[in-house]
């Protein structure tokens, strides 16, 4: 049996229904069997877990996703073995295997792989700060969302009106969410906002920086 699946990965927003397309061509016999299984990201195919079987004219959802899986066409004997997965969770991200068996059609292995990513908006990020906050010193502002798929990008902005910082005194890394402030001055003091963004949305946190004279302690 030759199985056809999309070559590009599938992305589905959190809570929506994913349709994992799988089609095939074979003269369906009574021994026809379909199995859908799931592998977590980074795990080998050998560690797949069955989530649905079809055999002897009957459908058998199985495992932790059993209440949320069904077939687009039941019975899946018309050449369409597409899986529907409702109310997708972040833990549904991974590789799905569509395997069709139909003896004596052994021309190919009857296996198709689909990568599913569940799209999750960024969670409210945590803003933190470390380093010397005295005049002339350097500090790092950090921002990180515990959730978000694809991984959010981070952008720091300073709120309010303030003099333009000298070039190179503010360097940010959109991937790590870190903002490095060097050669601090009293005018560096203020509120900084980090916005975490992906295709599903954005979330933000704020942090107030107080730059002090070298003789004084650090106040955050």
């Amino acid at each position: 049996v030759e199985v056809k699946v999309p070559t590009e990965p599938l992305s589905t927003p959190l809570g929506k229904t994913a349709e994992l397309t799988c089609t095939y061509s074979t003269s369906v016999g009574d021994s026809f069997a379909l199995e859908w299984s799931f592998v977590q990201p980074g795990k080998p195919i050998s560690e797949s877990h069955p989530i649905l079987y079809f055999t002897n004219g009957h459908l058998y959802p199985t495992g932790s996703k059993s209440k949320r899986v069904s077939l687009l066409q039941n019975p899946p004997t018309v050449g369409v073995a597409t899986l529907k997965l409702t109310d997708v969770h972040p833990s549904d991200t991974g590789t799905y295997l569509c395997q069709v068996n139909n003896p004596p059609d052994f021309y190919t292995n009857g296996l198709g792989l689909i990568n599913l990513t569940v799209l999750v908006p960024p969670s409210n990020p945590l803003c933190s700060q470390s380093g010397q906050t005295s005049v002339g010193g350097s500090t790092a502002l950090r921002c990180s969302s515990s959730e978000g798929a694809p991984k959010p990008v981070y952008n720091w902005v300073r709120l309010g009106t303030f003099p333009t910082p000298s070039p190179g005194s503010m360097v940010q890394d959109e991937v790590s969410g870190q903002l490095i402030l060097t050669n601090l001055s009293l005018t560096s003091s203020g509120t900084y906002r980090c916005v975490a963004t992906n295709q599903m949305g954005s979330a933000s946190c704020e942090l107030t920086l107080s730059v002090t004279e070298p003789s004084q302690g650090r106040v955050a």
Epitope: T23, S25, T26, S27, V28, D30, V80
Partner: antibody, heavy 118, light 107 residues
Framework: QVQLVESGGGLVKPGGSLRLSCAAS????????MSWIRQAPGKGLEWVSS????????HYPDSVKGRFTISRDNAKNSLYLQMNSLRAEDTAVYYC???????????WGQGTLVTVSS | DIQMTQSPSTLSASVGDRVTITCRAS??????LAWYQQKPGKAPKLLIY???TLPEGVPSRFSGSGSGTEFTLTISSLQPDDFATYYC?????????FGQGTKVEIK
């Protein structure tokens, strides 16, 4: 050699019923998917039903679904098509055909003519 | 449903001619295409399946090519026995459908 011989065609009134048969020989019938395909006079070919090797799975196009029933008797090497609620547009030569491992049709019978007319 | 469209509907040719018939599918059918030859009053005969595979006994002057949505049947040197009607059929997902046919007649 493979032989498929259809029978049971004839003249029937609209709304009537007819049962076609196909006698198979020369191959292992019980291992083969089978189909019925029809051809209206002067027209092209239309697949009308299929059945799996042991009869568990049957399929139909929308044009005949609910009116036609395909069945088989592997002990008798026979394929059947029960046609109910016949319409004028069902008038055609009906062929029985064996399916390959993929659903193309590698052997055909000579056909039997069904005429639906008042 | 997948629609199959053949062109031309009729083709006039002479013995020895190279003949090409085209079949288009309304959506991707990969290589799941068969070709049949039918003579008047006779049942169709399988010529090609999987777009390009010839069953045993089919003369090598017949060849098939294509994948996706566009396919061709070629007769490299037309013989007297080849004047007939030719049909394509997809063997992908149900319902399996045929093209409307191409009649190859003597010029």
């Amino acid at each position: 050699q493979v032989q498929l011989v259809e029978s049971g065609g004839g003249l029937v009134k609209p709304g009537g019923s007819l049962r076609l048969s196909c006698a198979a020989s020369g191959f292992t019938f019980s291992n083969s998917g089978m189909s019925w395909i029809r051809q209206a006079p002067g027209k092209g070919l239309e697949w009308v039903s299929s059945i799996s090797d042991g009869g568990l799975y049957t399929h139909y196009p929308d044009s005949v679904k609910g009116r036609f029933t395909i069945s088989r008797d592997n002990a008798k090497n026979s394929l059947y098509l029960q046609m109910n609620s016949l319409r004028a547009e069902d008038t055609a030569v009906y062929y029985c055909a064996r399916q390959g491992v993929r659903p193309f049709f590698d052997y055909w019978g000579q056909g039997t003519l069904v005429t639906v007319s008042s | 449903d997948i629609q199959m469209t053949q062109s031309p509907s009729t083709l006039s040719a002479s013995v020895g001619d190279r003949v090409t018939i085209t079949c288009r599918a309304s959506e991707n059918i990969y290589s799941y295409l068969a070709w049949y030859q039918q003579k008047p009053g006779k049942a169709p005969k399988l010529l090609i399946y999987n777009a390009e595979t010839l069953p045993e006994g089919v003369p090598s002057r017949f060849s098939g090519s294509g994948s996706g949505t566009e396919f061709t049947l070629t007769i490299s040197s037309l013989q007297p026995d080849d004047f007939a009607t030719y049909y394509c059929q997809h063997h992908y997902v149900i319902p399996w459908t045929f093209g409307q046919g191409t009649k190859v007649e003597i010029k």
